[in-house]
Amino acid sequence: LSITTPEEMIEKAKGETAYLPCKFTLSPEDQGPLDIEWLISPADNQKVDQVIILYSGDKIYDDYYPDLKGRVHFTSNDLKSGDASINVTNLQLSDIGTYQCKVKKAPGVANKKIHLVVLVKPSGARCYVDGSEEIGSDFKIKCEPKEGSLPLQYEWQKLSDSQKMPTSWLAEMTSSVISVKNASSEYSGTYSCTVRNRVGSDQCLLRLNVVPPSNKAG
């Protein structure tokens, strides 16, 4: 018994369907009952290999793994023909991991691994100030997407006034955090942060208002 499809990595976008191929050929001595098992080893490593779908005794069992309930199906109506491939529909971030196809027909046994990556465009980007927006103070301006596959790229722009970023910030213009030192009133204005990866981008805006220190006399 041998699996003819090679090991591979499959990349798909969130919400799409992933086709995980597993085609096998039998040899004349493989006379036992046909068992097909797909397992997942999730990327978060919190769980050991778990069965997600099983074909045994001419029946399909697909309710082993709650996270994939109703989303994993064999693609062939006749698994005995040598096609144990599956589709995973409506892909989610939690589906990232290593999938293993195991085919048994005694005495033959074979298995094959597929690494599935689910790519998610950045969304829910939030721009905010961490610290006090006062003249002479140090604070951080931050840009954080709610979700998005790594690696992420960041780009800050000043949208108001001269549209020139303060020169002391230039080294951090492509970082998610800009450390502002000894703030001056000229830093006030509207800034945008664009966060992007290879499947999409998102943007948030930040209004910076650098004011004189408040009197804290007691």
Epitope: S192, R198, Q203, L205
Partner: antibody, heavy 117, light 107 residues
Amino acid sequence: QVQLQQPGAELVKPGASVKLSCKASGYTFTSYWINWVKQRPGQGLEWIGNIYPGSSSTKYNEKFKSKATLTVDTSSSTAHMQLSSLTSDDSAVYYCAKGDGDYFADWGQGTLVTVSA
Amino acid sequence: DIQMTQSPASLSASVGETVTITCRASENIDSYLAWYQQKQGKSPQLLVYAATLLADGVPSRFSGSGSGTQYSLKINSLQSEDVARYYCQHYYSTPWTFGGGTKLEIK
């Protein structure tokens, strides 16, 4: 469905300016970049620049920085590109395209700009 | 600016054949790559983004692959409606640039 409507053609005189329009519908206009791409007759594609309608932030190809000015009117979901000091080199089809990131998922039909005396 | 070199500039193949178009970037673009199809007199259409992901509604006979600086677009079981010019485009860092295009004809 996403639609980007552009006028079919513009005839302009050398040295003049032209303002091209791109009316978007079928999606949230302020949430996606609008890109502009130039294609000279029988030639390849050149990216001019893009604008994010939600903030009017822009990015330009340095080659077109003194030639093109990108603006948006969010009330009518329309993007504009003004081309100035036109010469015969500017005769081309100009496409607007919606960016799902910085790849172009949906394209307008293009406006043919002809610069001729 | 990152240069995109596409090859071949033109190719002719028969219906049912498999064709491959390649695109080389002048530096690593980390799979920030898209492929477009442009039929005569029409606007370009997105086929593939992120180097490997098929755009909505694109037939599964199209597939993208590659990483680093080398990428390819494969068309399995060529159809007569695939006659077009194909372009790659990187979107790693501005300015985004396109390959010179590949003109695909049917024998």
